[in-house]
Interface confidence: low
């Protein structure tokens, strides 16, 4: 196809010889075509254009990329000729740096919607060169880490040696989307969340007398977490006594907050103390009821089919533990005054008698 009508952009990749880094080209198709190809997922069903390409082939890239050989040979299909370059929707990812990546890259819609779209293409002239050794020793890494829950910043590697005052205007992208909130050589993050992780691209313009280039760098940002230094705390039950009605079913809930741990093995169990004996109770599985970046709230219930006289003499203990330590909360049952008639009490005593027999045989098995 004729590429003379393609819009042209010049980019410079100055790669560090000390580190492995990636590079990304965006297929910046002129609007409004771009929205049809790259951002389909952002369109609501009522906004879908009539001639939207690839409605049956979601997994195929929406644009086609080519490389233009410098000797004037026909355009090369990147997927076939360059295994170190990955085509991903509207981006081209270079997995390895090197001057051999220098060249002209052309992107166009995989499927044109009308004859007028033949010129809907972008030609990117990419110059790749190693960063000179004279440049700043402490330049920012192409892999940067942010500690979850704290403040942090993401620096543009090609500009990290310049003060904010000297720095040119920078355009930032995250996972291919423009970030309009910052124009400086670093992004300050007031509180780091998981969503801050991703692939960031920073662009700035460098001009000489002859022409103007976009200098681009790619930063892989990962979010990391520090372990809690606290043992879990029990949120419920708060009170150490609980008023109950004899003969009625009862559920006691234990809720505890566990701080984040890199290997999370929370322990939560109920056990019963009766005189000198204590045993763990088989209760329903614990479940997570709230999960945040820094902690998780887990709940586990103990269920009594009917409260008996014996239960009033027992202590019900919720035990929780993480790698730092454990916490317990004891609950004593207390009969509600004026509750239940004679029938309820008689029923409760019958249950108690059956339970005593069951407990004694269970006890005998264990010892």
């Amino acid at each position: 196809f004729n590429i003379s009508g393609c819009s042209t952009k010049k980019l410079l990749w100055a790669y560090s010889t000390r580190s492995e880094e990636e590079f990304i080209l965006f297929c910046d198709l002129p609007e409004p075509q771009k929205s049809h190809f790259c951002h389909r997922s952002q369109l609501s069903p009522t906004q879908v254009p009539d001639h939207l390409p690839f409605t049956d082939s979601k997994d195929l890239p929406d644009v086609q990329w080519y490389r233009q050989p410098s000797n004037g040979d026909p355009l090369e299909d990147i997927r076939k000729s360059y295994p170190h370059i990955i085509q991903d929707k509207c981006t081209l990812r270079f997995l390895t740096p090197g001057v051999n990546n220098t060249g002209s890259y052309i992107c166009r819609p995989k499927m044109i919607k009308s004859p007028y779209d033949v010129a809907c293409c972008v030609k990117m002239i990419l110059e790749v060169k190693p960063q000179s050794n004279a440049s700043c020793e402490n330049s920012a890494s192409h892999k940067q880490d942010l500690l979850l829950g704290s403040t942090g910043s993401i620096s543009c590697p090609s500009l990290s040696c310049q003060s904010d005052a000297q720095s040119p205007e920078v355009t930032w992208y995250k996972n291919g989307k423009l970030l309009s909130m910052t124009r400086s050589n670093r992004i300050v993050v007031d509180e780091v969340y998981i969503y801050h992780q991703g692939t960031y691209v920073c662009d700035y313009t460098q001009s000489d007398t002859a022409s103007s280039w976009t200098v681009r760098a790619v930063v892989q940002v990962r979010t990391i977490v520090g372990d809690t230094k606290l043992k879990p705390d029990i949120l419920d039950p708060v009170e150490s006594t609980l008023e109950v009605e004899l003969g009625k079913p009862l559920t006691i809930s234990c809720k505890a907050r566990f701080g984040f741990e890199r290997v999370f093995n929370p322990v939560m169990k109920w056990y019963i103390k009766d005189a000198d004996l204590e045993w763990e109770v088989s209760v329903p599985e614990a479940k997570s009821i709230k999960s945040t970046l820094k902690d998780e709230i887990i709940e586990r219930n103990i269920i009594l089919e009917k409260v008996t006289q014996r239960d009033l003499r027992r202590t019900f203990v919720c035990f929780v533990q993480n790698s730092i330590g454990n916490t317990t909360q004891s609950v004593q049952l207390k009969e509600k005054r004026g509750s239940g008639g004679l029938n309820d009490i008689f029923e409760a005593q019958k249950i108690e008698w059956h339970e005593t027999v069951r407990f004694q045989s269970h006890h005998h098995h264990h010892h």
Epitope: D145, T223, I224, D227, K229, N265
Partner: antibody, heavy 124, light 107 residues
């Protein structure tokens, strides 16, 4: 670019204490976990333990009684001490950075930056 | 401790071959598995995390798969620089453990 530089003696006498230090350059020791791993000659890798910059440690139970890992944030370094060594402790010892990667629904930790390795021989 | 068993212990292959290494865990570890490459006299190099996610800068001919107890590392088309020893590592529970390694040699 974070780099790890290991230092310490290559020869230790039996029953003595092996001491190695790992210095972090090109980045801060803060906010990361740091591990020690060893590899006996011709064998596989064995994790010794980790330390968080705050001082929290976790050791391999098989070595726990003999291992101490400490951190000095002011010097940007962390250290390994292994007491009462025997010939079975002869190995290449590596220090490494552990990073947490938010992958799918969970956090997984991998050792993404390694020291150059120190060959330690236990012999009289 | 969770044991990781790699197979085969060693294998010979030629440049351009497709190679698969397996790693079996003694109990389920979800997808908390990483793969490393080690060349003689060098420190291990991190390749894959979360069983199948490729570390930045690792060539796309490397791929990982699996979940639970059975995992594989595949090199789709062997290059001369791929001849090395490969280790799997679990981070699901302490102590962290590694497989015994698979030595990949030139045929």
């Amino acid at each position: 670019q974070v780099q790890l530089q290991q230092s310490g003696p290559g020869l230790v006498k039996p029953s003595e204490t092996l001491s190695l230090t790992c210095t972090v350059s090109g980045g801060s020791i803060n906010n990361y976990y740091w591990s020690w791993i060893r590899q006996p000659p011709g064998k596989g890798l064995e994790w010794i333990g980790y330390i968080f910059y705050s001082g929290t440690t976790n050791y391999n139970p098989s070595l726990k009684s003999r291992v101490t890992i400490s951190v000095d944030t002011s010097k940007n370094q962390f250290s390994l001490k292994l007491s009462s060594v025997t010939a079975a402790d002869t190995a290449v010892y590596y220090c490494a950075r552990d990073v947490g990667i938010a992958a799918r629904n969970s956090y997984y930790y991998v050792m993404d930056v390694w020291g150059q390795g120190t060959t330690v021989t236990v012999s009289s | 401790a969770i044991q990781l068993t790699q197979s085969p212990s060693s294998l010979s292959a030629s440049v351009g071959d497709r190679v698969t290494i397996t790693c079996r865990a003694s109990q389920g570890i979800s997808s908390a598995l990483a793969w490393y490459q080690q060349k003689p006299g060098k420190a291990p190099k991190f390749l894959i995390y979360d069983a199948s996610s490729l570390e930045s800068g690792v060539p796309s001919r490397f791929s990982g798969s699996g979940s639970g107890t059975d995992f594989t590392l595949t090199i789709s088309s062997l290059q001369p620089e791929d001849f090395a020893t490969y280790y799997c590592q679990q981070f699901n529970s302490y102590p962290i453990t590694f497989g015994q390694g698979t030595r990949l040699e030139i045929k």
